[in-house]
Amino acid sequence: QGWQAFKNDATEIIPELGEYPEPPPELENNKTMNRAENGGRPPHHPFETKDVSEYSCRELHFTRYVTDGPCRSAKPVTELVCSGQCGPARLLPNAIGRGKWWRPSGPDFRCIPDRYRAQRVQLLCPGGEAPRARKVRLVASCKCKRLTRFHNQSELKDFGTEAARPQKGRKPRPRARSAKANQAELENAY
């Protein structure tokens, strides 16, 4: 049994460490900045493109609270959802409803996560005295991937390339909070 994947209810499967049932994300601050910035150079002709780097897809930003059992993150996390049809970069609209969708005939190009980042989140829990934290793996960027009929769904779960490792530094650790403080913050958060 390897690292599990959990669905964040927003089109993409995000690899996680264990399996943690997630409720639908709370799109309280749904910043859907539709960007088509993963493309390469424009193709010679929209229907003759062979190079995956010439395709682009949209990165939707949204925020959600991380939950783990009865616990919830003190702050929401912002992550990307890789969305939409992959098409030649120069034809891809910058927003839904603008321009014309280009549908490739032939190989299936999928908009999938390219890189991930892990973020440590402080959890607010009812009761419990130990400081609780969880690391969530979030999509950092998207890419178009050419899928043939031989590719299966597991192709969509690859971790992509690792981001550069940050320098190891020391941070003060979170203090344990009292059950009452935890509960109050939880209730306020909702």
Epitope: G2, W3, E16, L17, G18, Y20, D68, G69, P70, A118, R120, C125, P126, G127, G128, E129, A130, P131, R132, A133, R134, K135, V136, R137, E162, R165, P166, K168, G169, R170, K171, R173, A176
Partner: antibody
Framework: QVQLVQSGAEVKKPGASVKVSCKVS????????QHWVRQAPGKGLEWMGW????????EYASKFQGRVTMTEDTSTDTAYMELSSLRSEDTAVYYC???????????WGQGTTVTVSS | DIQMTQSPSSLSASVGDRVTITCRAS??????LAWYQQKPGKAPKLLIY???TRLSGVPSRFSGSGSGTDFTLTISSLQPEDFATYYC?????????FGGGTKVEIK
């Protein structure tokens, strides 16, 4: 597939130190919390502490405070646990474990036997 | 420290039996409880966390219940590969502590 591979068995004299390594593969170590748990012969499990390899944050059980040091090398995805001032009661199998939270242990290494004997 | 008391410390059962192991905490630990399975000479394996959430890949015959101070691990129909020692662990208060273990042996 997540794997944690620990260093080999050690025999130490009382008062000495031991450093056990734990190589993590299948996931970057910085994306996890690393835990150390030990088990004396024929006994139960005892949590020693956790560390966050990304920022060097640690939390040790008070019983081991001052004697234990947990570190990581994120370039090689390896965690280390050093226990000093060894005594015979420290004879145990030492396990590294990893998880995405500070309070449970999702995956475990195979264990490293440390024997403290004069 | 929170004391975790498991009972029984050992039990003998046959394949197909329903087995129940209990774990009692010395103070309220809400649902911050995990169950692990350990076979001789091997490392423990996480089975259940949050008292009742089964880890992916763990057979459905394993179930956990309880909150507060009293918790139960149930194996609905014991299989040959289930003969092992089971430990509970509280994740409520530092230091995290384990129960003494319950050894499930073949009758």
């Amino acid at each position: 597939q997540v794997q944690l591979v620990q260093s080999g068995a050690e025999v130490k004299k009382p008062g000495a130190s031991v450093k056990v390594s734990c190589k993590v593969s299948g996931f970057p170590i910085k994306d996890t919390f690393q835990h150390w748990v030990r088990q004396a012969p024929g006994k139960g499990l005892e949590w020693m502490g956790w560390s966050d390899p990304e920022i060097g944050d640690t939390e040790y059980a008070s019983k081991f405070q001052g004697r234990v040091t947990m570190t990581e090398d994120t370039s090689t995805d390896t965690a280390y646990m050093e226990l000093s001032s060894l005594r015979s009661e420290d004879t145990a199998v030492y396990y590294c474990a990893t998880g995405d939270t500070t309070y449970k242990f999702d995956f475990w290494g195979q264990g490293t036997t440390v024997t403290v004997s004069s | 420290d929170i004391q975790m008391t498991q009972s029984p410390s050992s039990l003998s059962a046959s394949v197909g039996d329903r087995v129940t192991i209990t774990c009692r905490a010395s103070q309220d630990i809400h649902t911050y409880l995990a169950w692990y399975q350990q076979k001789p000479g091997k490392a423990p394996k996480l089975l259940i966390y949050w008292a009742s959430t089964r880890l992916s890949g763990v057979p459905s015959r394993f179930s956990g219940s309880g909150s507060g101070t009293d918790f139960t691990l149930t194996i609905s129909s014991l299989q040959p590969e289930d003969f092992a020692t089971y430990y509970c662990q509280q994740g409520d208060t530092l230091p995290y502590t384990f129960g003494g273990g319950t050894k499930v042996e073949i009758k």
